[in-house]
């Protein structure tokens, strides 16, 4: 299992992971105490046939070619959590591990 | 976590799981002994903002709106394996649980 890593200077057109810092303050999300910002990353690029396919299923659907099935798209295939400190809306402050906040790898599915 | 289920008569335009039977014989894959065919399903449909989003990350990337980030796409969010009996290319026949062969749920990511 692997995926491509790119940056803003890359000329790669295929499915790739790009750096992205999410800034909660810029969103006006003041209910998040910490972190103020974090490296989230995102996926972008083209999914040519078989390139970086996560699942055998993706290949099988391409073979079967059912009505209305789009080609695979560039999407997170591995994600990880971050720890956050936040108001939970009930006047409580919670420290918790929030799943699927960081993209570690991108692929076609 | 939930997802929509549709069939060929559905008028649903949003991201949905559709039935699909994969027939290995029709593909000419004679290295697969069993099953001959199985219910794989597939995902198709539109991903309007926030609809069936699997990850908070998807929403955050939409907010941050980085260069080249496409909107979320309709993709498997829950998959399951099937047991297969197949020739492994080394004159051996193997029984194995092949992961991510069946789409159980679709969502936007």
């Amino acid at each position: 299992d692997f995926g491509l890593d790119c940056d803003e200077h890359s000329t790669e057109s295929r499915c790739c992971r790009y750096p992205l810092t999410v800034d909660f303050e810029a969103f006006g999300w003041d209910w998040i105490i910490a972190p103020k910002r974090y490296k989230a990353n995102y996926c972008s690029g083209e999914c040519e046939f078989v390139f970086l396919q996560k699942y055998p299923h993706t290949h099988l659907v391409h073979q079967a070619n059912p009505r209305g099935s789009a080609g695979p798209c560039c999407t997170p295939t591995k994600m990880s959590p971050i720890n956050m400190l936040y108001f939970n809306g009930k006047e409580q402050i919670i420290y918790g591990k929030i799943p699927a906040m960081v993209v570690d790898r991108c692929g076609c599915s | 976590d939930f997802g929509l289920d549709c069939d060929e008569h559905s008028t649903e335009s949003r991201c949905c799981r559709y039935p699909l039977t994969v027939d290995f014989e029709a593909f000419g894959w004679d290295w697969i002994i069993a099953p001959k065919r199985y219910k794989a399903n597939y995902c198709s449909g539109e991903c309007e903002f926030v609809f069936l989003q699997k990850y908070p990350h998807t929403h955050l990337v939409h907010q941050a709106n980085p260069r080249g980030s496409a909107g979320p796409c309709c993709t498997p969010t829950k998959m399951s394996p099937i047991n297969m009996l197949y020739f492994n290319g080394k004159e051996q026949i193997i029984y194995g649980k092949i992961p991510a062969m069946v789409v159980d749920r679709c969502g936007c990511s």
Epitope: - | E25, G28, D30, W31, I33, A34, K36, N83, L85, F87, E91, Q92, I93, I94, Y95, G96, K97
Partner: antibody, heavy 116, light 107 residues
Framework: EVQLLESGGGLVQPGGSLRLSCAAS????????MSWVRQAPGKGLEWVST????????SYPDSVKGRFTISRDNSKNTLYLQMNSLRAEDTAVYYC?????????WGQGTLVTVSS | DIQMTQSPSSLSASVGDRVTITCKAS??????VAWYQQKPGKAPKLLIY???YRYTGVPSRFSGSGSGTDFTLTISSLQPEDFATYYC?????????FGGGTKVEIK
Amino acid sequence: EVQLLESGGGLVQPGGSLRLSCAASGFTFSSYAMSWVRQAPGKGLEWVSTISSGGSYTSYPDSVKGRFTISRDNSKNTLYLQMNSLRAEDTAVYYCAKQDYAFDYWGQGTLVTVSS
Amino acid sequence: DIQMTQSPSSLSASVGDRVTITCKASQDVSTAVAWYQQKPGKAPKLLIYSASYRYTGVPSRFSGSGSGTDFTLTISSLQPEDFATYYCQQHYSTPWTFGGGTKVEIK
């Protein structure tokens, strides 16, 4: 109704050769892998060989590898087992079987006796 | 090669009895075990595949269970036509191997 009919068995001397056939009917022969399984008199079952539905892939245990060759003719709905360099320990009833996850249909078998 | 050890090698039972036959694999075979019934002078018949799936047309009194290395064939209420020899087989990886058989006889 699925039917598998083996033929070609008989008495052969050690070192000799024999070709078994299995005529299949009642199912789409070309869609299924096929196997041979044998049973020595009064003994248990032993897998001998398997061939894929299209005939591209084969598998054998070490006990027969290099001596036995499985093949098929999908146009004739027939499975074959070519047995060379036969030994006394190859004496058995040979069954052909339709293959799914397991052997789901068996023929009635043909007896091969290797003796001088 | 994977060894399949079947027990008992023979048993005597009466019509209506519950009969249990076990098979132990020498290594993990997941759920890749089949069970066959063979009567004298006849070809084996498939009863159970993938440990617990009853084959088409097999009476519901036959059931299979187990995974890993330990497997069981159970006949919930023995019928006159069930007196036969039963074999387990692993279909996990070639060379496929069979147990030595269990002969079920009339008490």
